[in-house]
């Protein structure tokens, strides 16, 4: 029959070539001479000429060694034609199967594989996987079937069989207990991949297993007892650096220390932080310590890690004896800010108040006083008694120095300690108003027509406070009332000035006396420009020169 069973050809054949494979034969050759040919990849299309057929004999030839890893199967067509070129058979499938030879060693996908596992894990824990490939056939033969094994382990501690590898998957697992990062931080395994399912060619690679840190070591104080000296009152002062050792991986949460003051700090005077590089506990004062109240503190500090312990571990404790050192403390004014009411304009030499300071120190130190800041120079202070007296006129209405009736003075107290220290106090003088200012009209110049004049409304101001202000009273003096009238409005805070007789165009002085509710009188001269005009005017019309 015009059929060829699949032809198996081993790869890497040694020849000699051409090599006979099979004979194509049509039974039509009884009737006529048959010519044979083949087509397909490997025959008349790339890779061309690998296979050929003798036209008259039908012998199929192989012209070169085959490589299964390049082409594993060739699918050709055989043709049979008569002498006149007519096809005598349908094209026949010719399958050439390239059978595998074990001509490739396994190859690891990496020279070095890296994996990691936590120290102290149980046997059976998976670590990593190594992979090797083999180009040979692993389906129909064992040529490409890779078996993995561990050839060696370095270091061989605690013994040489800490790991195992799955023969077929390459998964490396822990086989023994005793992984301890602090003793062996890294293992180097020489792994083997062997084809023929472990019976053939071998290749090696390195598997580096990093042992990851677990918090299986507690930090320990070294030393456990400390003595420190701290000046009183110092806030944020470094008292002591506490040193710990921890065998776990530096700069990891299992190594980084967490400090806690367990006792001895009832007043919450201290705080402890961890230094980010050295891991030391930095004990500092949260508040100032008071030598006079307590001159020694005994603190108990416990250390743990940022990460929890993976097993029950004893906690290390340190004892710190803090000796508080006496310092010369500054006098403190009582109160720190003193408010005193005083009448403005009191006579020079009149006492204002006594403002004194207390010294926190136990010794009876002498305190002397002086004024530190007195912007207007109105006050003096007795250095011994702290008596404050007026040496200038206190003026409530002085806008340069007085704000909201308050005059602010800073005073200084100095003790006679060694070295001397100073404290300051603030004296706030609330100045009580006296009727020392009369009412004043605004504006003090007016322009008015001499015919149908418009009434001029003047505002009245008084620097004093109520009740030394409105209602005001107005009165014209020095014959000004002949030509003018002045009336205070109902509210009593404006005065209306009216021209009651004709005056020729000129400038006139109007003498206006205003008095406040406390009868403080103030005489003001109003300059009135009279113009030849009717009604309202801003400036006199025409070329006119005031006399």
């Amino acid at each position: 029959d015009w059929v060829v069973a699949p032809i198996s050809v081993p790869e890497n054949g040694k020849g000699p070539f051409p090599q006979r494979l099979n004979q194509l034969k049509s039974n039509k050759d009884r009737d006529t001479k048959i010519f044979y040919s083949i087509t397909g990849p490997g025959a008349d299309s790339p890779p061309e000429g690998v296979f050929a057929v003798e036209k008259e004999t039908g012998w199929l030839l192989l012209n070169k060694p085959l490589d299964r890893e390049e082409i594993a199967k060739y699918e050709l067509f055989g043709h049979a034609v008569s002498e006149n070129g007519a096809s005598v058979e349908d094209p026949m499938n010719i399958s050439i199967i390239v059978t595998d030879q074990n001509d490739h060693k396994p190859k690891f996908t990496q020279d070095t594989f890296r994996g990691s596992v936590l120290e102290g894990v149980m046997p059976g824990t998976s670590v990593m996987q190594v992979t090797a490939t083999d180009e040979d056939d692993a389906v129909n033969t064992y040529n490409g079937v890779v078996a993995y094994s561990i050839h060696s382990q370095e270091p061989k501690e605690p013994h040489d069989l800490m790991f195992t590898i799955h023969k077929s998957t390459g998964t490396i697992s822990v086989i023994s207990s005793g992984l301890d990062r602090e003793k062996v931080p890294e293992y180097r395994l020489t792994v083997q991949a062997t084809d023929m399912d472990g019976e053939g060619s071998t290749t090696t690679a390195e598997a580096v297993v990093q042992i990851l840190d677990a918090n299986d070591n507690a930090p320990e104080f070294d030393p456990q007892k400390y003595e420190a000296h701290v000046p009183e009152n110092a806030v944020g002062h470094e008292v002591q650096r506490l040193t710990v050792t921890d065998l776990d991986a530096p700069n990891s949460p299992a190594w980084r220390a967490t400090y806690l003051i367990m006792g001895g700090d009832d007043g919450d005077h201290f705080t402890i932080t961890t230094h980010p590089e050295s891991n030391q506990g930095i004990l500092t004062t949260r508040k100032g310590l008071d030598f006079e109240a307590k001159n020694q503190h005994t603190l108990y500090v416990e250390v743990t890690n940022e990460a929890p312990f993976v097993l029950k571990l004893p906690t290390s404790t340190a004892t710190i004896v803090v000796h508080v050192e006496d310092v010369n403390e500054a006098p403190v004014f009582v109160p720190p800010s003193k408010v005193v009411e005083v009448q403005e304009g009191i006579p020079t030499g009149e006492p204002v108040c006594v403002y004194t300071a207390e010294d926190p120190d136990k010794e009876n130190q002498k305190i002397s006083y002086r004024i530190l800041r007195d912007p207007a120079g109105w006050l003096a202070m007795d250095p011994d008694s702290g008596q404050v007296t007026a040496v200038g006129t206190l003026d409530r209405e002085d806008e340069q120095f007085v704000r909201n009736n308050i005059y602010e003075v800073m005073v200084l107290a100095m003790d006679n300690g060694s070295p001397p220290t100073t404290g300051t106090g603030t004296l706030l003088l609330t100045l009580i108003d006296v009727n020392d200012h009369g009412p004043v009209p605004e504006p003090r110049q007016i322009t008015i027509c001499n015919q149908s004049p418009v009434r001029q409304v003047l505002n009245i101001t008084d620097k004093d406070l109520s009740p030394h202000t409105s209602p005001f009273q107005a009165q014209l003096t020095d014959d000004s009332d002949i030509y003018w009238t002045a009336e205070v409005n109902e509210e009593g805070d404006t005065v209306v000035l009216s021209l009651k007789k004709f005056l020729k165009q000129d400038t006139y002085d109007v003498h206006l006396s205003l008095s406040d509710h406390g009868n403080k009188e103030q005489l003001t001269v109003i300059r009135a420009t009279v113009c030849d005009c009717h009604g309202h005017v801003e400036t006199c019309p025409g070329p006119w020169k005031g006399g």
């Epitope: 040694k14 051409p18 040919s37 000429g49 012998w59």
Partner: antibody, heavy 118, light 107 residues
Amino acid sequence: VQLVEESGGGLVKPGGSLKLSCAASGFTFSSYAMSWVRQTPDKRLEWVATISSGGHYTYYPDSVKGRFTISRDNAKNTLYLQMSSLKSEDTAMYYCASYYYGIPFGYWGQGTTVTVSS
Amino acid sequence: ELVMTQSPSSLSASLGEGVSLTCRASQDIGINLIWLRQEPDGTIKRLIYDTSSLDSGVPKRFSGSRSGSDYSLTISSLESEDFVHYYCLQYGSSPLTFGAGTKLEIK
């Protein structure tokens, strides 16, 4: 009838070159592998070169590899052997022979003599 | 390379007599062996291929056989044209190698 006829033999000095030809007739030349075989003066036969039917692949023994080149022109039904760096031991009768039934050497020519001598 | 040891190198026999020529292969070549004959004028012809298959036009007095690594050409009844040179060639291993030849002479 399959016929092959060699030509191109002659006398050549050592280190010289020579090209032999083999004209084929009476069969489909392009579908058969072809070879050169030589017979030394002591009557020993030695395979020299083979070329696949399509001319894609060539084969040589170590004794001539790198010095001899076999080629073919299927359009002209002609086989060639280019010989260079000739040695006295290359002196022989050179035959061209065809594969037949997928094996050597089904049909032989009459041969052409090559003499390498100074 | 594979060596073909042909024996005898020469053989005298009478017309009508039967003779056998032998080639021994130094390695396994399977059935990949042919026998050739060379006429006095240098003409070479293949007689047998694949150890025992007769080429077309070859008389039936010629036959080939194998016993292990020994390959034989047998001429059952010698005729006058048979007194020529005979060679074996193996094509089971590369390179192709010939036997040294046997010269068959008339007694």
